[in-house]
């Protein structure tokens, strides 16, 4: 942004009424009037080029400094070419000197050269030669100097002529300000430019109405340079929740729109399954029956719990049940569906029921399932089981109702065979078993597993379709662990107890005696 100039002194605009002091009085500098474009113009001129050893001073009136720290002095002047005078005027000069003096009071006509400090020698870029002068075509020079820092209440400028032919047409003294500025939704006040060229004055901005510094963001700051220009913007403001940027202001979201946080983004239209929002909304409320989970962004449509799993089947396989289901027909608008399986067992003889989580085994943890099947094992024969599969999503916890489907199954796994030792010898064991007659038709074979007691590394297996077997080639006076298991179309039935049977010792009499 361009600097703003505040004028403290403008000779050209004063119309010759400033009454500057000349020294020596009545000599040297003189106020003259000319007509240019039918307008009177005033100038101070001096042209004692022939006289040698000139020391003519022109002092401005006392200028009140105000808040200025550094002043800028713009001079418009003409200088005649020394060669345009007869004999080249050996004492003729083509420059003049610019001075200033600070003071806390106006000295009036009391002029003291020693109080003044030289600012610079002012030399023209172009001099006015004879031909130009005769053609009334003077070359106007513009020079600018600056002084600072100033500390007293006011100051004077003075112009020292040392033998030049000079006309001073304009003296303009001003200081610079960084103008009031709106940038990045922050307001920066008008600020006086600093006095030291390398330093930049840091200025804090204030957020415009309904704008805020974002969390973790930097406060808005800018730097006011010596020349009155704003530089190096830092930080910014953003329109707060419920407001969006329109040009350099924050405007409330229109009805039906919302903005949930301070950001650069515009207001968004309310998502699906929300109620129309009022002006300046930070979110849109959900329609009845729809919800927003705590972690859901405000831009996401409101959702609802899923319906129950669509189909649920329970397929019994011996002491196992495979539960399969299909996803809910209505997901509630969410993708984070999980399933929970619970189990209830009922004793047929008493009709009493209770949870069975402690006594069954699931193929994977039964809560938070993402797959649509699970196998439940270790079910007890002749027990009635009811399995409940509940579908849940991220908003299910916000309602009391549950979405579930149930399936019941009776376990008709074969009973464990009842095993007996029928006979034994020193090298053999005759074993028989029985299962209830209604179950016998389901069994296609029996598997007999046996091993020496104390030898857990090796075991033997015999399969038979009958209800007895003789285990041969055994060691005398040795205990064997024997187990019988029914094999059915559904897999293995329940295994019998592990029994301990002992062969006879060699001195034991009577073969196959029990």
């Amino acid at each position: 942004a361009q600097g703003k100039e505040v004028v403290l002194l403008d000779f050209a605009a004063a119309g010759g009424e400033l009454g500057w002091l000349t020294h020596p009085y009545g000599k040297g500098w003189d106020l003259m009037q000319n007509i240019m474009n039918d307008m009177p113009i005033y100038m101070y001129s001096v042209c004692n080029v022939m006289s040698g050893d000139q020391d003519n001073w022109l002092r401005t009136n006392w200028v009140y400094r105000g808040e200025a720290e550094r002043i800028f002095i713009e001079l418009k002047f003409t200088v005649r070419d020394c060669n345009s005078f007869p004999g080249g005027a050996s004492s003729c000069k083509e420059t003049f000197n610019l001075y200033y003096a600070e003071s806390d009071l106006d000295y009036g006509t009391n002029f003291q050269k020693r109080l003044f400090t030289k600012i610079d020698t002012i030399a023209p870029d172009e001099i006015t030669v004879s031909s130009d002068f005769e053609a009334r075509h003077v070359k106007l020079n513009v020079e600018e100097r600056s002084v600072g820092p100033l500390t007293r209440k006011g100051f004077y400028l003075a112009f020292q002529d040392i033998g030049a032919c000079v006309a001073l047409l304009s003296v303009r003294v001003y200081y610079k300000k960084c103008p009031e500025l709106l940038q990045g939704l922050a307001h920066f006040p008008e600020t006086i430019a600093g006095s030291d060229a390398p330093s930049l004055a840091t200025v804090a901005g204030t957020c415009v109405d309904h704008a805020v510094v974002p969390p973790g963001g930097e406060e808005p700051r800018m730097h006011c340079a010596v020349d009155g220009e704003w530089l190096v913007p830092i930080g910014q403001c953003l329109c707060q929740a419920g407001y969006e940027k329109v040009e350099d202001a924050c405007q409330a979201c229109s009805p039906g729109f919302f903005k949930f946080e301070a950001s650069e983004s515009p207001c968004l239209e309310c998502p699906e399954h929300t109620l129309p929002s009022p002006e300046g909304a930070t979110s849109c409320e959900c329609e009845e029956g729809f919800f927003r989970a705590p972690q859901d962004p405000a831009s996401m449509p409101c959702t609802r719990p899923p319906s129950a799993p669509h189909y649920l089947t329970a397929v019994g396989m011996g002491a196992k049940v495979e539960l399969r289901w299909t996803p809910p027909q209505d997901s509630g608008g969410r993708e984070d569906i999980v399933y929970s399986v619970t189990c209830e067992q009922c004793w047929p003889e008493s009709g009493e029921c209770g949870p069975c989580e402690a006594s069954v085994r699931y193929s994977e943890p039964p809560h938070g399932l993402t797959r649509t099947s699970v196998t439940v094992s270790d079910l007890e024969p002749h027990m009635n089981y009811t399995f409940t599969v509940e579908a849940r999503n991220g908003v299910s916890g916000l309602v009391t109702s549950r979405s579930f489907r149930t399936a019941s199954v009776s376990i008709n796994q074969t009973e464990p065979p009842k095993v007996r030792l029928e006979g034994r010898s020193t090298t053999s064991l005759s074993v028989s078993w029985s299962i209830p007659p209604p179950q016998q038709s389901r069994v296609w074979k029996y598997e007999v597993t046996y091993r020496k007691k104390g030898d857990s590394n090796s075991y033997n297996v015999r399969r038979t379709e009958g209800f007895s077997v003789t285990l041969d080639d055994l060691a005398p006076d040795t205990t064997y662990l024997v187990q019988v298991q029914a094999l059915t179309q559904e897999g293995q039935g329940a295994g019998s107890k592990v029994h301990e049977f002992q062969t006879l010792s060699p001195e034991g009499s009577g073969n196959l005696a029990v």
Epitope: P416, K453, S456, T479, F501, Q502, L504
Partner: antibody, heavy 130, light 108 residues
Framework: QVQLQQWGAGLLKPSETLSLTCAVY????????WSWIRQPPGKGLEWIGE??????????NYNPSLKSRVTISVDTSKNQFSLKLSSVTAADTAVYYC?????????????????????WGQGTMVTVAS | SYVLTQPPSVSVAPGQTARITCRGN??????VHWYQQKPGQAPVLVVY???DRPSGIPEQFSGSNSGNTATLTISRVEAGDEADYYC???????????FGGGTKLTVL
Amino acid sequence: QVQLQQWGAGLLKPSETLSLTCAVYGGSFSGYYWSWIRQPPGKGLEWIGEINHRGSINYNNYNPSLKSRVTISVDTSKNQFSLKLSSVTAADTAVYYCAKPLRPHCTNGVCYSGDAFDIWGQGTMVTVAS
Amino acid sequence: SYVLTQPPSVSVAPGQTARITCRGNNIGSKNVHWYQQKPGQAPVLVVYDDSDRPSGIPEQFSGSNSGNTATLTISRVEAGDEADYYCQVWDHSSDHVVFGGGTKLTVL
């Protein structure tokens, strides 16, 4: 009806040897596996080990966690069996029980390892403290 | 080694049925025995071989065993049934007696 009567020192210092004896009255002694079981204060039951005297041979079986310190012996002439536990510490403070299994170990070729304990001694509180 | 897991406590109102479970891998293949122990007394055998009762034990005590769970059922519970209950099996792999951790039955 079988009865079990047990006795032994009730207060020991660390590193000493615990010694308990259990007498069997009113029933057969041979053919059974006789067990020792203990119960630390406020805790559950822990099986220590068992012994069976058959013919002239003693068959012992001990809990692996105590095996290095335990000895169970039998005196068939007195129908008694004994427990010795060496190098005791405060962790061995418990009520110690002797126990009889429900059935003889093997009858007609059918054996019952780890049978149910139908008769228990009255228990002996053993405290190990310095 | 073989582990038997029992719930630490079970509560039941008088007249109701209490069920105390004992879980162990393939426990159905083993004979399970149950003991009742009242404070300051030696344990008493109440069920052996899964479901048999010794003489003198009332028929309100019954047991079952299949798969990985054995259950002691006490029907028509009375205040006098308040005690600790332990299950026990023989582990054929290690040839050792194993007890469950015990369950405290509280009659409300």
